[in-house]
């Protein structure tokens, strides 16, 4: 696949919103352990958001391992419900403005902002530093611009970018989503590359949501954030499919990511479909 091809990825209209996990171990990667047995087990895949089969070696590993598909679903899927987002062109806010505050599963607690749909205003909240959902803004202004009702209806600022001094690449200044684009992949795909706190220089990839491509960066070996992949393919699989551009009734168009300041009104209705 050339990068040109990557730019023209089209996906269906049933993308799920950012993942909300019931238990932190559901985010662990499948770990077969060091032993050599061949045991059929199940794990929750955060990228496909489904419980999947894997071969377990019989010792060690991690908690994201279940004897049965049912047990995995019970522990890691929320009410066994699939959330589908339908798009119309009436109301004003992106769907993620209506999500509840979500601290995520990590414990590096920091102050962030979310739109509180009960009080109809942006408020601060305690964020754990990873995962969570897209109702999560670094600044109050950002939250207000995207989720609060402005004096002239809904206004979206242009998508700010900055040059990252660490790896000399363009990274988003924030998790602000550009007007005609929606991101329904994992929310960490919108975070900047983060070297972390240690002194190693490992080759990793992060998803640069400004240019819509996976780019290399040097990882220090510890800390950082979830936008960190050992291969470009893994990065693309996790993040690339999340970006879509919509036209009128939820149709899709191929796009190169050249973005201009635009005003849009998009409404989202949430439908909860119980798994049969």
């Amino acid at each position: 696949d050339s990068e040109e091809d990557e730019e023209h990825t089209i996906i269906t209209d049933t993308e799920l919103p950012p993942l909300k996990l019931m238990h932190s171990f559901c985010a662990f990667k499948a770990d077969d352990g060091p032993c050599k047995a061949i045991m059929k087990r199940f794990f929750f895949n955060i990228f496909t958001r489904q419980c999947e089969e894997f071969i377990y070696g019989g010792c060690e590993g991690n908690q994201n391992r279940f004897e049965s598909l049912e047990e995995c679903k019970k522990m890691c899927t929320r009410d066994n419900a699939n959330r589908i987002i339908k798009t119309t062109l009436q109301q004003e806010k992106p769907d993620f403005c209506f999500l509840e505050e979500d601290p995520g599963i990590c414990r590096g607690y920091i102050t962030r902002y979310f739109y509180n749909n009960q009080t109809k205003q942006c408020e601060r909240f305690k964020y754990g530093g990873c995962l969570g959902n897209m109702n999560n803004f670094e600044t109050l202004e950002e939250c207000k611009n995207i989720c609060e009702d402005g004096p002239n209806g809904f206004q979206v600022d242009n998508y700010g970018t900055q040059l990252n001094a660490v790896n000399n690449s363009l990274t988003p200044q924030s998790t602000k989503v550009p007007s005609l684009f929606e991101f329904h992949g994992p929310s960490w795909c919108l975070t900047p590359a983060d070297r972390g706190l240690c002194r190693a220089n490992e080759n990793r990839f992060y998803y640069n949501s400004v240019i819509g491509k996976c780019r290399p960066f040097k990882y220090s070996g510890c800390g950082g954030n979830e936008n960190n992949f050992t291969s470009k393919q893994e990065c693309l699989r996790a993040c690339k499919k999340g970006f879509i551009q919509r036209i009128s009734k939820g149709g899709l168009i191929k796009t190169k990511r050249k973005r201009k300041k635009q005003r849009v009104k998009i409404a989202y209705e949430e439908i909860f479909v119980k798994n049969m």
Partner: antibody, heavy 119, light 108 residues
């Protein structure tokens, strides 16, 4: 006029619990966070936690999470802080203070409640 | 947690002199989240400066605040008798919210 009026001084034995109150007036109680901060001679000011009465959102300082319980009674616009398993190091002045939902500018404070833990 | 270290612990100056109080953070704190409080004996703390440099209502213009990252400063250009008090820096960028141990500004 915004006012936060705290309950009176307490003398407690080690191992006991204490429940302090903070009655708010002059503003919409449910629209602000209420913080609890204590001041000890050795430790200076220590943030215990905060509660937002409308939705019952609470954030604790991990240091106090197992011993402190924050509650709020919307009907009387009163916030409470209970501290259990008291020890001598908990001897301090305990303050309630309000802040808005967007920052932590603690713009109004109670007068403080002195808690003494002694056998 | 972010530890805020204030220096000096005590500052002895005379009215009319310039006072410089420092607050050093163990990790970087956004300037929007760094506040200062003033406290006088027997009273609760009072919000004094928000967002590093924004003076709270009623705070005289001789006070100013500056800094970024891990280094912040509160400056009083010319001390008045009522300025002698304890000053605390405070951060709410990271949980738990923390305060410095305070700088006591006393009359020389």
């Amino acid at each position: 006029e915004v006012q936060l009026v705290q309950s009176g001084a307490e003398l407690k034995k080690p191992g006991a619990s204490v429940k302090l109150s903070c009655k708010a007036s002059g503003y919409t109680f449910t629209s602000y966070w209420m913080h609890w901060v204590r001041q000890t001679p050795g430790q200076g000011l220590e943030w215990i936690g905060e509660i937002k009465p409308d939705q019952g959102r609470i954030n604790y300082n991990e240091k106090f999470k197992t011993r402190a319980t924050l509650t709020a009674d919307k009907s009387t616009s009163t916030a409470y802080m209970e501290l259990s398993s008291l020890r001598s190091e908990d001897t301090a002045v305990y303050y309630c203070a309000r802040s808005s939902v967007v920052d932590v500018a603690m713009d109004y404070w109670g007068q403080g409640t002195t808690v003494t833990v002694s056998s | 947690e972010i530890v805020l270290t204030q220096s000096p612990a005590t500052l002895s100056l005379s009215p009319g002199e310039r006072a410089t109080l420092s607050c050093s953070a163990s990790s970087s704190v956004s300037s929007s989240y760094l506040y200062w409080y003033q406290q006088k004996p027997g009273q609760a703390p009072r919000l004094w400066i928000s967002g590093t440099s924004i003076l709270a209502s009623g705070v005289p213009a001789r006070f100013s605040g500056s800094g970024s990252g891990t280094k912040y400063t509160l400056t009083i250009s010319s001390l008045e008798p009522e300025d002698f008090a304890v000053y605390f820096c405070h951060q709410w960028s990271h949980y738990p919210f923390t305060f410095g141990q305070g700088t006591k500004l006393e009359i020389k």
